[in-house]
């Protein structure tokens, strides 16, 4: 029973007041004429956090977000009126909500906003060096934002800007019906997914986009989109949501005769995050909310962390599932989904798969095609009618690494930090919720690396009022976490070792990989430090073995709360 394990009770539960009083949170409470601090871009080099919001773009100092610069980028009164005339809400919709904020080159960012239901993009100058202290809008250079930013501020864009080209998953029309994955900017003709074909995309909600190399040859690079969408008829009885991972080759330039200016290498697969139910029916967490890629050593094989919630209004729950890219690739090399038979059900395609296999990038690695425009007609025809894979991607260990079903909140965001501790490396998850709290959770391997135990270290309230956490970034350099919501932004340190108490036992029992007992206090653990006196036991949290200071007695309550 995952959700009710003893480790699901937080070691520390800190209210907003306690966070403030202990100097563990810095907040930017927003401007009177702005809101929706949802679009984050972290720049560790410049030590800045760029944030897109309503009618504004901010540049926050990573050391202290109280120190910031701002650009005001509203819409003209005419655009605002036009939007109002279209029956939209003047405050919530008829403004410029920034949805895309990406590094364009060494000196500029690229930003796109809803433009009061008239998407617009521009460049922001940030200078060559941090000391230039430049942060200004290129007023002379505005571009059409269609296919880059949604019209409707309620919708998200998943975007990625690489080599001067913008990949974006968004809604490309006023009504919010024409969802597509686009590639714009750059020197090539814009490319998109097939229009009005529910087999490709079926009312999707895009979460994020990531470039993941396939091999050492950059020609094989793929862009992966994470999204959720309506299950296609026949795939599921009744209306259901499915979480998806989609792939596109970076060097896809569309077809020659068919799929002209459309992706020829687009494939998608379902992401499963479920637990076995008591009656043999699995409980599915299908509403993908956020994704975090943990890159470690090998950029080709990041670990994918996904945050999911249930679709049901009756049963509310959240889960975190982990996926390996080798499992993802195996599914994309597996059978395609095919509609056949008297009931028009989805079955694995059994026929001949054309060569080169649809979804393969044109490169020297996998065959002699230089461009997708050279692909044979049968490959293009097959690709157009078979965008989905039959097999789903199952999570590592075939189950979530964390579940919450007995609480009045749901998970919304996740970032993960890999921490060196005395007894190995640990992944620490910071999970944002829809009530403005952040959970700090450590994954502890049991017998094998695949078998993980989740320990809930802290539950922190980071906003004064309950508000949905809509963005999170983690700075390893600053050892800080940055959190966005409609109301504002919060900054907090990744660790609060001193709060764990004044004795070795308490420090050990905390099982926080960031913290160790140094002989006199619970403080930040640095693996490079030579001190042999550091006491820490993340795997077992056993003070008896590690603490010899006599400070154990009466301090063994594992669920010590600070209220």
């Amino acid at each position: 029973n995952y959700q009710n394990g003893k480790n699901n009770v937080p070691r520390l539960k800190l209210s907003y007041k306690e966070m403030l009083e202990s100097n563990n949170v810095i907040t930017f409470n927003g401007l009177a004429n702005s809101s929706s601090y949802h679009t984050f871009l972290l720049d560790e080099e410049r030590s800045r956090l760029y944030v897109g919001a309503k009618d504004h773009i901010f540049s926050f100092n990573l050391v202290n977000i109280k120190d910031f610069q701002k650009i005001v980028w509203p819409v003209s009164y005419t655009r605002r009126d036009e939007c109002k005339w279209a029956g939209k809400d003047i405050l919530k919709e008829c403004a410029n909500f920034i949805k895309v904020l990406k590094a364009y080159n060494q000196t500029h960012l690229y930003a796109c906003g809803t433009g009061a239901f008239h998407p617009i993009c521009t460049y922001i100058e940030i200078g060559h060096h941090p000391e230039d202290n430049i942060f200004k809008l290129e007023n002379s250079h505005f571009e059409n934002g269609r296919g880059k930013s949604p019209y409707d501020p309620k919708l998200l864009t998943a975007s990625l800007l690489i080599d001067g080209e913008l990949y974006s998953g968004t809604a490309a029309d006023f009504m919010g019906r024409d969802f597509a994955i686009f590639r714009t900017l750059g020197h090539h003709h814009p490319i998109r997914t097939e229009q009005h074909d529910s087999r490709w995309l079926n009312d999707p909600r895009f979460i994020s986009a990531h470039l993941i190399p396939e091999s050492d040859n950059p020609e094989d690079d793929k862009v992966y989109f994470f999204f959720r969408e309506n299950a296609i008829d026949g795939e599921h009885s009744g209306k259901a949501t499915h979480a998806r991972i989609g792939q596109i080759c970076k060097n896809d330039f569309g077809g020659h005769r068919s799929l002209v200016n459309k992706w020829t290498t687009f494939l998608k697969a379902r992401l499963i995050c479920s637990v076995p139910g008591p009656n043999g029916i699995d409980t599915h967490f299908d509403e993908l909310q956020d994704v975090f890629l943990m890159n470690f050593k090998d950029p080709k094989n990041p670990i994918v962390y996904g945050v999911f919630t249930t679709s049901s209004n009756i049963f509310k729950g959240s889960a975190v599932c982990m996926y390996s890219m080798s499992d993802v690739r195996r599914v994309f090399l597996g059978p395609y989904a095919h509609r056949d038979g008297p009931n028009y059900q989805w079955v694995p395609y059994q026929g001949r798969v054309p060569y080169p296999r649809p979804g393969t990038c044109p490169s020297k690695t996998f065959g002699g095609f230089d461009s997708t425009k050279d692909l044979p007609d049968d490959v293009i025809t097959f690709a157009r009618s078979h965008p989905a894979m039959y097999n789903p991607v199952f999570p590592i260990n075939n189950r979530p690494i964390m579940i919450k079903t007995d609480v009045n909140y749901q998970f919304t965001q996740i970032v993960v930090d890999r921490v060196d501790a005395e007894d190995g490396q640990y992944d620490v998850m910071f999970i944002g919720t829809d009530v403005g709290t952040v959970l700090k959770v450590v994954s502890i391997p049991k017998e094998t690396w695949h078998d993980l135990e989740e320990v809930l270290l802290e539950e922190m309230t980071v906003f004064r009022e309950p508000t949905t956490i809509s963005a999170m970034e983690l700075s390893t350099k600053q050892q800080q976490l940055y959190i966005g919501s409609t109301a504002g932004i919060a900054q907090l340190p990744l660790h609060r070792c001193d709060i764990y108490g004044k004795a070795c036992a308490e420090c050990c029992l905390a099982r926080d990989p960031y913290c160790a007992w140094d002989g006199s206090s619970c403080s930040r653990y640095f693996p490079t430090a030579k001190a042999r006196t550091r006491a820490q036991d993340i795997r077992n949290g056993d003070p008896l073995t590690h603490c010899s200071d006599g400070g154990i007695e009466g301090r063994m309550d594992h669920h010590h709360h600070h209220h």
Epitope: R80, D81, K84, W85, Y151, F174
Partner: antibody, heavy 116, light 111 residues
Framework: EVQLLESGGGLVQTGGSLRLSCAAS????????MSWVRQAPGKGLEWVSW????????YYADSVKGRFTISRDNSKNTLYLQMNSLRAEDTAVYYC?????????WGQGTLVTVSS | QSVLTQPPSASGTPGQRVTISCSGS????????VSWYQQLPGTAPKLLIY???HRPSGVPDRFSGSKSGTSASLAISGLRSEDEADYYC???????????FGGGTKLTVLG
């Protein structure tokens, strides 16, 4: 210089149909909402319909709803008004206007006469 | 009958100052920008004032607009003979979901 040139007006019987066109130049047509406004002989101005810059949304005055259809072709920089089931009270000069929070540029108008 | 109410006519002698009023409600003038249009005899209307009080380039500063509550007014100072025209006020009406005009005011320059 912004120019709007209407065409397609003329004499039509009650219940008949007519299609008005408006050719635009001198501005980025695809960036702006467009509208039709009419003026009955010797009377004041009456807004008829408007269309979003990308055709994403269309709006009509109650007096023409269900009978008139506004459309545009951004590749041709042209605005259209398809008028069906015409009535005597639809007799007017029809102006095409560029929308910019108000009607900042107007065409010279085309006369539509509906005779019974 | 027009949603916005204007006097049917107004007059003045050259050099004089003339004011034309436009009365509406909270669903139009009260919560939306007012524009004024000039229609010279036999020509198409032309935008004179936008966003209550702003003049497009090329419009002389003799023309000014103002708004208070649910009423707006157009003032023309230093009246000239070429100002003889029909003047219309207009605004978006939130409850009707449409643009509404006043019935128009015929301005006559005497003498």
């Amino acid at each position: 210089e912004v120019q709007l040139l209407e065409s397609g007006g003329g004499l039509v019987q009650t219940g008949g149909s007519l299609r008005l066109s408006c050719a635009a130049s001198g501005f980025t047509f695809s960036d702006y909402a467009m509208s039709w406004v009419r003026q009955a002989p010797g009377k004041g101005l009456e807004w008829v319909s408007w269309i979003y810059y990308d055709s994403g949304s269309k709006y009509y005055a109650d007096s023409v709803k269900g009978r008139f259809t506004i459309s545009r072709d951004n590749s041709k920089n042209t605005l259209y008004l398809q008028m069906n089931s015409l009535r005597a009270e639809d007799t007017a000069v029809y102006y095409c206007a560029k929308l910019n929070g108000d009607f900042d540029y107007w065409g010279q108008g085309t006369l539509v006469t509906v005779s019974s | 009958q027009s949603v916005l109410t204007q006097p049917p006519s107004a007059s003045g002698t050259p050099g004089q100052r003339v004011t034309i009023s436009c009365s509406g409600s909270s669903s139009n003038i009260g919560n939306n920008d007012v524009s004024w249009y000039q229609q010279l005899p036999g020509t198409a209307p032309k935008l004179l004032i936008y966003a209550d009080s702003h003049r497009p380039s090329g419009v002389p500063d003799r023309f000014s607009g103002s708004k208070s509550g649910t009423s707006a007014s157009l003032a023309i100072s230093g009246l000239r003979s070429e100002d003889e025209a029909d003047y219309y006020c207009g605004a978006w009406d939130s409850s009707l979901s449409g643009y509404v005009f006043g019935g128009g005011t015929k301005l006559t320059v005497l003498g």
